[in-house]
């Protein structure tokens, strides 16, 4: 049986999809849709790229990898049980019937009930996707406390406070990408 990709309610899901651009920057349109790949295009499109950039996306769906190098893997934020199912990644290679189609099965597991850590407070509402790691593994949004105004000095301070948290090792080992907004 084909493998399934997994995520837990409330976490992000990551669905892999890769192609090799003919030359660096020589991109091919890609679409992601909910449901198996139809004969043409994607059904229920959630994200689309063209030859240059992401030109359509819906809330909670984004590309975390370097899509200019052919990494068009999909991130679905804050998944619910309703996000379970088949997703289509379609690499729209020019020419008749040249498209590469990938159907990926996503399984959502119920959230585990665990006591809230005492040192962490909710931060994501004010600053969604602000601190994410890149490199070895999945992007992880860290919840650090409500700060209405933030600057690089504060981010540095926050990173220090992260030493004992779940993300600390990834920040050290993978390096961090800081994204605002």
């Amino acid at each position: 049986s084909e493998v399934e990709y997994r995520a837990e309610v409330g976490q992000n899901a990551y669905l892999p999809c890769f192609y090799t651009p003919a030359a660096p920057g020589n991109l091919v349109p890609v679409c992601w849709g909910k449901g198996a790949c139809p004969v043409f295009e994607c059904g229920n499109v959630v994200l689309r790229t063209d030859e240059r950039d992401v030109n359509y996306w819906t809330s909670r769906y984004w590309l975390n990898g370097d899509f200019r190098k052919g990494d068009v893997s999909l991130t679905i934020e804050n998944v619910t049980l309703a996000d379970s199912g088949i997703y289509c990644c379609r690499i729209q290679i020019p020419g008749i019937m040249n498209d590469e189609k990938f159907n990926l099965k996503l399984v959502i597991k119920p959230a585990k009930v665990t006591p809230a850590p005492t040192r962490q407070r909710d931060f994501t509402a004010a600053f969604p996707r602000m601190l994410t790691t890149r490199g070895h593994g999945p992007a992880e949004t860290q919840t650090l406390g409500s700060l209405p105004d933030i600057n690089l000095t504060q981010i540095s301070t926050l990173a220090n406070e992260l030493r004992d948290s779940r993300l600390a090792n990834d920040l050290r080992d993978s390096g961090a990408t800081i994204r605002i907004g």
Epitope: Y5, F18, E140
Partner: antibody
């Protein structure tokens, strides 16, 4: 840096249960699946199974379902594989390996391997 | 189970040669194919993921191509440090499976 440190070589009698450990460091232990693999001398690699350290959910290769039991101890970031009723066929090098991207089913970091010898 | 067939089983080369290793799947696996290098008495090391995508820290001389059932790992100029075993692995279907490997040795 990301590291997986496995327990040392073991010599066991046939039928005596054996446990191999794999201590993870340098990353968030519960954020990536951990896989176990078998390699017999001069042979290829076999995937035994995997465990999700966040909730201990496992998936085993059917070939090993009566042979291997996978567990984790989150407090020490350590994974364990227990092999039941070992025979000479179980003599091999066993590896733990971290999933390349949470749950994408390739292996980007490997332990150094644990040599198991089953002999009377 | 998906069977991965690697060829040749052994390849004898001279440093500086260009090398291509083949991996063929018993059924279509899209591009869910990954390549590993294993030197003697060492653990395997990931070289290429998803058929053609490079891995941070791996020399750029390694490249992969293919999709569906036929895949190739190439390197443009073999060095002595490249000798060892090369394995392909599929992540399309359970159970995850590996090829038997290609041994790259000095001619």
């Amino acid at each position: 840096q990301v590291q997986l440190q496995q327990s040392g070589p073991q010599l066991v009698r046939p039928g005596a249960s054996v446990q191999i450990s794999c201590k993870a460091s340098g990353y968030s232990f519960t954020s990536y699946l951990l896989h176990w693999l078998k390699q017999r001398p001069g042979q290829g690699l076999e995937w035994i199974g995997m465990i999700d350290p966040s909730d201990s959910e496992t998936r085993l290769n059917q070939k090993f379902k009566d042979k291997a039991t996978l567990t984790v101890d989150k407090s020490s970031s350590t994974a364990y594989m227990q092999l039941s009723s070992p025979t000479s066929e179980d003599s091999a090098v066993y590896y733990c390996a971290r999933d390349g991207y949470y749950a994408w089913y390739y292996f980007d970091c490997w332990g150094q391997g644990t040599t198991l010898t089953v002999s009377s | 189970d998906i069977v991965l067939t690697q060829s040749p089983a052994t390849l004898s080369v001279t440093p500086g040669d260009r090398v291509s290793l083949s991996c063929r799947a018993s059924q279509s696996i899209g591009n869910n194919l990954h390549w590993y290098q294993q030197k003697s008495h060492e653990s395997p090391r990931l070289l290429i993921k998803y058929a053609s995508h490079s891995i941070s820290g791996i020399p750029s001389k390694f490249s992969g191509t293919g999709s569906g059932t036929d895949f190739t790992l190439s390197f443009n100029s073999v060095e002595t440090e490249d000798f060892g075993m090369y394995f392909c692995q599929q992540s399309n279907s359970w159970p995850l499976t590996f090829g038997a490997g290609t041994k790259l040795e000095l001619k």
